[in-house]
């Protein structure tokens, strides 16, 4: 595997939230990452993530399959060969019903500072 | 080129468990997932689960969650499908694979050989 | 688990016809769909991804086509070395699951 440093992913946006599915917009660099390792977690359950993978040329990707009213965190992580970017984060609550498409809020989005180097 | 070779054929008990193995070769290993599909006689496709070895955490289809263990050894560029409290209709051929669209875009999807697994008392 | 649900389980048709096999997702799925064919004691083969994107070296008698939970596998004039059992896969959201297969059989 390669030492050298594996770019950071930039940052993440909920593009749109409808009360069974929402957009995820993304930075990163052109050209860094062979696919994106996205993981939707519902808040405050033990229940398995959704994980999906997206090619490294995407940044923006369709999460279907969620739940109305729900609080998930969805982070995402780029990855090349045998590195992993740090995880970034974002907390979003779908809406109620189809009345509250897209005005559902984004919380908060953050990154860490460090990559993970997988040996 | 990518090579996936399984482990040999099994003959097993009732209630038992087996572990297939699946080793890769000629082509990155950690950050690519590994599926394992298994095919009974006369029957179609099903999709067990699948793991990412450099993230390490498997996904698996409903249909197995408690009964199947999927593991990688990222040193051994090697992946694992146990599977436990066999039955007779666990009787089938399983193969480990590299799939178009989880964890993996490559051009061609690649297959091992494939291994069979007889439950019978 | 999503469910593929694939129709027809079986046809028969003769050899230039035009066939298609339906697969529907019990919820939207990110169009990460791929058609295979399997024939006896072989490993399955891709035929197309992205639901509508032609393998390399596939026949361009075979397309793929839908989005959202409805997509078809079309081949348009079919040829003996098509007589096969088609599969579709959902692989964009884990656990990814197949359709039950469709067989194509010689009428």
């Known amino acids: 595997a390669s030492t050298g440093e594996t770019p950071n992913l930039g940052e993440v946006v909920v593009a749109e939230v409808g009360w069974d599915a929402l957009k995820l917009n993304w930075t990163a660099p052109e050209g860094a990452y062979e696919y994106f390792f996205i993981q939707v977690q519902e808040a405050d359950t033990v229940e398995a993530a959704q994980n999906l993978t997206v090619p490294g040329g995407l940044r923006s990707t369709d999460l279907p399959g969620l739940k109305a009213a729900t609080h998930y965190t969805i982070t995402i992580r780029g990855v090349t060969q045998d590195f992993s970017t740090t995880p970034l984060s974002v907390e979003v609550l779908t809406a109620s019903g189809l009345n509250d498409i897209f005005e559902a809020q984004k919380i908060e989005w953050h990154e860490g500072t460090h990559h993970h180097h997988h040996h | 080129q990518v090579q996936l070779v399984q482990s040999g054929a099994e003959v097993k008990k009732p209630g038992s468990s087996v572990k297939v193995s699946c080793k890769a070769s000629?082509?990155?290993?950690?950050?690519?997932?590994i599926s394992w599909v298994r095919q009974a006689p006369g029957q179609g496709l099903e999709w067990m689960g699948g793991i990412i070895p450099i993230f390490g955490t498997a996904n698996y289809a409903q249909k197995f969650q408690g009964r199947v263990t999927i593991t990688a050894d990222k040193s051994t560029s090697t992946a694992y499908m146990e599977l436990s409290s066999l039955r007779s209709e666990d009787t089938a051929v399983y193969y480990c694979a590299r799939l178009y669209g989880y964890a993996y875009y490559g051009a061609f999807d690649y297959w091992g050989q494939g291994t069979t697994v007889t439950v019978s008392s | 688990d999503i469910q593929m649900t694939q129709s027809p389980s079986s046809l028969s048709a003769s050899v230039g016809d035009r066939v298609t096999i339906t697969c529907r997702a019990s919820q939207g799925i990110r169009n990460v769909l791929g058609w295979y064919q399997q024939k006896p004691g072989k490993a399955p083969k891709r035929l197309i991804y992205d639901a509508s994107s032609l393998q390399s070296g596939v026949p361009s008698r075979f397309s793929g086509g839908g989005s959202g939970t409805e997509f078809t596998l079309t081949i348009s004039s079919l040829q003996p070395e098509d007589f096969a059992t088609y599969y579709c896969l959902q692989n964009g959201l884990q656990p990814a699951t197949f359709g039950q297969g469709t067989k194509v059989e010689i009428k």
């Open positions: 000629g082509g990155t290993f950690s950050s690519y997932a």
